[in-house]
Interface confidence: low
């Protein structure tokens, strides 16, 4: 069936443009050939203009964007929220991690404080660190922990005798701390749970902040002017002709769409697998792979490789004493 | 400062619990995140759809226009576009996504791979051991997933996990300290607080 | 500092119901489980709403079980309760708590209270 | 549901004094995994209650030494070895080992 006759005086377009630019100048009075028009191509004549066309493809690209962003809300937020507070939940653990090592110290071995307390402080600081993506080497933080913790034990533990006035005891200390396996195979088993746990904590934590990333670039695409026009074409073109009140055909409108976010859906196969893949990851965050876990029974590990190294104190305090000998009689002079 | 003193020590073994799960672990609500995540698994192939139903788009009316006029909404004139000598929309389609989709397509292929790398192998720690196959007697632990209700029915078997403490309200100090370990009795180990 | 706010209470009359809201302030709300208890006339306590941090989790104990429902808003910080159905029994200050996470079942944090009163 | 008494209902003292306030529970608030789980709050006048103790004799931060908490099983105590004027107000004892959580009735705390 034919079109209904375009309104004579292309009022009704007038009133309807007005509220998407105020000022009416680019409204022809009474229907016009509009054989300058590039997008809605009149059947006769029309209420449109080649700027008005030009006025339509903005507010069409401009509605894509919006309806694209109320479309993302929801997701945005649920992952926003949740990166927020599974970065805050990871900060209080470690925390909790440093204060629970600390208090075993200040408990159990009140004679290593306060040297401790920095040794342990500065190792959960790097622990921070790595979970928010510092490139440093886990085994190295552990080590340097036992390290800094030996010369300490052994001065004020096995040996409180040595004069503190020198310290180069503490270098031989340090190496003989690795040499002689001072602390048995707790420093391994600290470094295996600690850099499975925070491998896994640290990708989690990346992953969430992608899927932000990754909502964000979708939530603000400029869609191009091909887009642009079909939109144009859909949602506008039918005023030209008067049909202020017509909807776009439902098929119609899912052609267009497809057309216009088929870039975006080639992000699907992608966004399937990333959800999938942390569900995977998720489900094996626990045990050696669950940093709260690993962190919070640390003081516990510590507590007891100190005691492993109090067991062996005096087969320890011989081979040091001959090993480290050289600084030990720099030391008494 | 302040802060709430807590168990520290857990058993070594899967415990049984009911459906009703109190007081949460992080790794619960690692696991609503991902529950909540799957709801939008179609997310993207699902937006075309979304979006026309969330636009003016003719539902009930017998007319609708196809881009060019006005035809009746069953009719095979309303899916075509009338575009046919504007622009092609496979021409459209074959461009390829937008440089900055493109890249953001690359960053989710790196981090699928990574979490793929990173995720547990099945056979590894999901592997039951001797003492997760509930040899044990199935007690719940205060840094556990608590027994809540009556044992029996809707019970199910949960994973071990420390109880997460959310308390941002004060900083800790060292004051705040866990009790010389216990090595008798690791169940019942405690924090206990000093106070000045 | 912490801080609960509750509001929303009121008369009410027998059958009638009322909306209870409770904004919370100074800790992360979002991580935390919540729940509301009240106080009678008489000063006794009743736990009467338990909501998990993720809001996946709710309880009720029998006395109020399908008349009340707890819900929360982690992005206002603010946790709900609705009443419905309320009898002269119901009559009490209502407090909204914070449960320790890592102590089953010992509230942490209260609230001021807000009092509901139910009378014909 | 488990039945919280406390005893007695009003506890006349002279500042200085021990107080002694007594809570009997309906059955055992032994945990399956060995934690009891019952807790003392104190309510002054006009404010919400506030932690004292959790799980029978484990002070909360910040609260003084006079405050003491002990028994087991079904039977627990709550003793105060020197009152203070700060110290006046409401007891309650509660129990979080069942579902639901309750309380008891509230002992008050009073001058002589």
């Known amino acids: 069936q034919p079109p209904p006759p375009p309104d004579a005086t292309c009022h009704q377009v007038r009133s309807f443009f007005q509220r998407l630019q105020p000022g009416l100048k680019w409204v022809p009075e009474t229907p016009v050939p509009g054989s300058d028009l590039q997008v809605c191509l009149p059947k006769g004549p029309t209420c449109c203009s080649r700027k008005m066309e030009e006025k339509y493809q903005l507010t069409a690209r401009l509605n894509m964007e919006q309806l694209l962003q109320s479309a993302s809300m929801e997701l945005k937020f649920l992952i926003i929220q949740n990166a927020a507070v599974f970065q805050e939940a990871f900060e209080i653990v470690v925390r909790h991690a440093k204060n629970y090592t600390n208090a075993m110290f200040k408990n159990n071995y009140p004679s290593l404080t306060p040297q401790a307390f920095e040794f342990v402080g500065e190792f959960f600081t790097d622990v921070s660190l790595y979970i928010l993506g510092s490139d440093i080497n886990v085994d190295d933080m552990v080590n340097e922990l036992f390290d800094s913790l030996f010369p300490v034990i052994y001065t004020q533990m096995m040996n409180p005798g040595l004069p503190e006035s020198v310290l180069d005891i503490n270098e031989c200390l340090r190496g003989a701390r690795r040499d002689l396996k001072v602390f048995g195979s707790f420093p391994k088993l600290i470094m295996t749970q600690v850099s499975k746990s925070l491998q896994v904590t640290r990708i989690f934590l990346q992953a969430l902040n992608l899927g932000i990333e990754v909502i964000n670039t979708t939530d603000h695409l400029k869609f191009s002017k091909d887009c642009g026009r079909m939109l144009t074409r859909m949602w506008y073109c039918s005023y030209c002709q008067g049909l202020m009140m017509v909807k776009p055909c439902g098929g119609y409108c899912n052609v267009v769409m497809q057309g216009c976010m088929a870039g975006v859906v080639e992000i699907d196969k992608y966004w399937r697998e990333y959800i999938l893949s942390l569900e995977e990851l998720v489900n094996g965050m626990y045990r050696i792979y669950d940093m709260e876990n690993v962190l919070l029974g640390l003081f516990s590990t510590i507590h007891d490789s100190i005691q492993y190294v109090q067991k062996n104190g005096g087969k320890l305090t011989t081979t040091i004493g001959k090993l480290c000998a050289h600084s030990q009689q720099r030391q008494y002079r | 400062s302040a802060y709430y003193p807590e168990d520290l020590f857990i058993d070594k073994k899967i415990l049984k619990v009911a459906h009703v799960e109190h007081e949460e672990t992080l790794s619960s609500r690692r696991r609503e995140l991902i529950q909540k995540l799957k709801s939008f698994i179609n997310f993207y192939s699902a937006l075309p759809g979304y979006i026309c139903s969330h636009s003016p788009v003719a539902e009930n009316d017998t007319l609708c226009w196809n881009g060019q006029e006005l035809v009746e909404r069953y009719s095979q004139k309303a899916a075509r576009n009338g575009m046919k000598n504007q622009f092609n929309l496979h021409e459209l389609k074959m461009k390829g996504p937008e440089p900055v989709v493109s890249q953001i397509i690359d960053k989710l292929k790196h981090i699928n791979q990574l979490l793929r790398t990173m995720s547990v192998p099945k056979g590894k720690v999901l592997d039951k051991s001797l003492d997760e196959e509930g040899l044990e007697s199935g007690d719940c632990g205060d840094d556990e997933d608590e027994c809540i209700g009556s044992s029996g029915d809707g019970m199910v078997k949960v994973k071990n996990q420390l109880r997460f403490l959310a308390e941002l309200a004060y900083d800790l100090d060292v004051d705040d300290a866990p009790g010389n370990k216990q090595h008798g009795n690791q169940k019942d180990n405690e924090i206990t607080t000093s106070h000045s | 500092a912490v801080q609960l706010v509750e509001s929303g209470g009121g008369l009410v009359r027998p059958g009638g119901s009322l909306k209870l809201s409770c904004a919370a302030s100074g800790f992360a709300f979002s991580t935390y489980g919540m729940s509301w208890v009240r106080q009678t006339p008489e000063t006794r306590l009743e736990w009467v709403a338990y909501?998990?941090?993720?809001?996946?989790?709710?309880y009720y104990p029998d006395s109020v079980k399908g008349r009340f429902t707890i819900s929360r808003d982690n992005a206002k910080n603010t946790l709900y309760l609705q009443m419905s159905s309320l009898k002269s029994e119901d009559t009490a200050m209502y407090y909204c708590?914070?449960?320790?996470?890592?102590?089953?079942?010992?509230?942490?944090?209260w609230g001021q209270g807000t009092l509901v009163t139910v009378s014909a | 549901d488990v039945v919280m008494t406390q005893t007695p209902l009003s506890l006349p003292v002279s500042l200085g004094d021990q107080a002694s306030i007594s809570c009997r529970s309906s059955?055992?608030?032994?945990?399956?995994?060995?934690?009891?789980?019952l807790h003392w709050y104190l309510q002054k006048p006009g404010q919400s209650p506030k932690v004292l103790i959790y799980?029978?004799?484990n002070r909360f931060s910040g609260v003084p030494d006079r405050f003491s908490g002990s028994g087991s099983g079904t039977d627990f105590t709550l003793k105060i070895s020197r009152v203070e004027a700060e110290d006046l107000g409401v007891y309650f004892c509660s129990q979080s080992t069942h579902v639901p959580y309750t309380f008891g009735g509230g002992t008050k705390l009073e001058i002589k």
């Open positions: 708590a914070s449960l320790s996470i890592m102590i089953r079942g010992w509230f942490a944090y």
């Open positions: 799980k029978v004799s």
């Open positions: 909501i998990s941090s993720g809001g996946a989790t709710t």
């Open positions: 059955q055992s608030l032994v945990h399956s995994n060995g934690n009891t789980y």
